[in-house]
Amino acid sequence: MAVTACQGLGFVVSLIGIAGIIAATCMDQWSTQDLYNNPVTAVFNYQGLWRSCVRESSGFTECRGYFTLLGLPAMLQAVRALMIVGIVLGAIGLLVSIFALKCIRIGSMEDSAKANMTLTSGIMFIVSGLCAIAGVSVFANMLVTNFWMSTANMYTGMGGMVQTVQTRYTFGAALFVGWVAGGLTLIGGVMMCIACRGLAPEETNYKAVSYHASGHSVAYKPGGFKASTGFGSNTKNKKIYDGGARTEDEVQSYPSKHDYV
């Protein structure tokens, strides 16, 4: 019962998390104009991963997409990639976890298969959450760097004649949505991995007994009766999980440095 609850809760938490990651990716408020030094402004700028927007004091808002692909900063492209990978992995994870749910019966699917699927979806959720958190954090770091660069250059270049504040950008709502959503997906993934342990049929430990038949000597060992849970010495299952680990590594194999122009 506790296993079903853990699995179900993990699924729901991951579902909310992935919905949040999708929402964050689509949101326009990744960076918003800093109004600290200029609270009364005729226009308010905010930017997303896909377009920039201007909201006027009249309430009118206009947005324009980033129609170029090559002209965009490498960091922005990297963030886009991380968020999309997170969404794709999360979506696949959700699909797998639906079939893995203990409360759903599909044909004569064994508990061992459900355990494997639960673990797979759990790993996918964890990687998905990490991708989202990484993407949002990279963008946040980019904002912080640019913010302080703007602050340093605020009154320069005009001989101190014009005391005007350069437009600076600070954290938008999408960043917080992304962090929370990534965290939820991560937690959901961990819960699925925990549930997987409970789903695996417990192995029965029998003592090795030797039966001496006339003319033949055959020893029966309990290893052959081990359930294929992936926690025993079953090499087939080990390979499945190794494959999963490789996928995780491949997902994270991005260039370590992104030049921001």
Partner: antibody
Framework: QEQLEESGGGLVKPGASLTLTCTAS?????????ISWVRQAPGKGLEWIAC???????TYYASWAKGRFTISKTSSTTVTLQMTSLTVADTATYFC????????????WGPGTLVTVSS | DVVMTQTPASVSEPVGGTVTIKCQAS??????LAWYQQKPGQPPKLLIY???TLASGVPSRFKGSGSGTEYTLTISGVQCADAATYYC?????????????FGGGTKVVVV
């Protein structure tokens, strides 16, 4: 005192190119403004050419100006208008104007610079 | 592009009278309209924006109204200083592709 000043006008031959510059003083284009170029032929009405939103360097042109005119923000105090393949019909006083938002209208204008296209 | 049609082309009014200038847009411009006053040898001066909001320093005898495609500028109690050419302009909306087209202008003569 916030001011705009146009420069780069003068006498040119048909087919020539010319770049007009709008220079800000007392404020900076690093802030968010809509800067437009407007022209007025002698004895005629006002004709809007192009606009740039300095916040993102978004640009927009009158349909007749596309291709021949290019508006751009070249520094935190200058916006330029590049004009190519000039004809006699382009003879006019060229103004640059600033709006605080697309909604607010152009509340700051330069005195204008005269461009004469003649052979 | 939006086409702004301004009427009449010229109007003559005695001091103290009322002048009404109409401006019609070829499509709805959602009250994104400005009115300007221009005197010979000078750049235009903003009078009204947002169809009805008076710009700072503009006398209250200037009044803007209208919505959709039909807009009006009314000058009540006309003074000699009001003799000028008046232009309506559709406000620039960059992303939606609405240009800042001007009307043909209305010359106001105060007699």
């Amino acid at each position: 005192q916030e001011q705009l000043e146009e420069s780069g006008g003068g006498l040119v031959k048909p087919g020539a190119s010319l770049t007009l510059t709008c220079t800000a003083s007392g404020f900076s284009f690093s802030n968010n403004y809509y800067i437009s170029w407007v022209r007025q032929a002698p004895g005629k009405g006002l004709e809007w050419i192009a606009c740039i939103y300095t916040g993102y360097s978004w640009t927009y042109y009158a349909s007749w100006a596309k291709g021949r005119f290019t508006i751009s923000k070249t520094s935190s105090t200058t916006v330029t208008l590049q004009m190519t393949s000039l004809t006699v019909a382009d003879t006019a006083t060229y103004f640059c104007a600033r709006a605080d938002s697309g909604y607010s209208g152009f509340n700051l204008w330069g005195p204008g610079t005269l461009v004469t296209v003649s052979s | 592009d939006v086409v702004m049609t301004q009427t009449p082309a010229s109007v003559s009014e005695p001091v103290g009278g009322t002048v009404t200038i109409k401006c019609q847009a070829s499509q709805s411009i959602d009250s994104r309209l400005a009115w300007y006053q221009q005197k010979p040898g000078q750049p235009p001066k903003l009078l009204i924006y947002g169809a009805s909001t008076l710009a700072s320093g503009v006398p209250s005898r200037f009044k803007g109204s209208g919505s959709g495609t039909e807009y009006t500028l009314t000058i009540s109690g006309v003074q000699c200083a009001d003799a000028a050419t008046y232009y309506c302009q559709c406000s620039v909306t960059i992303s939606t592709g609405v240009g800042g087209a001007f009307g043909g202008g209305t010359k106001v003569v105060v007699v």
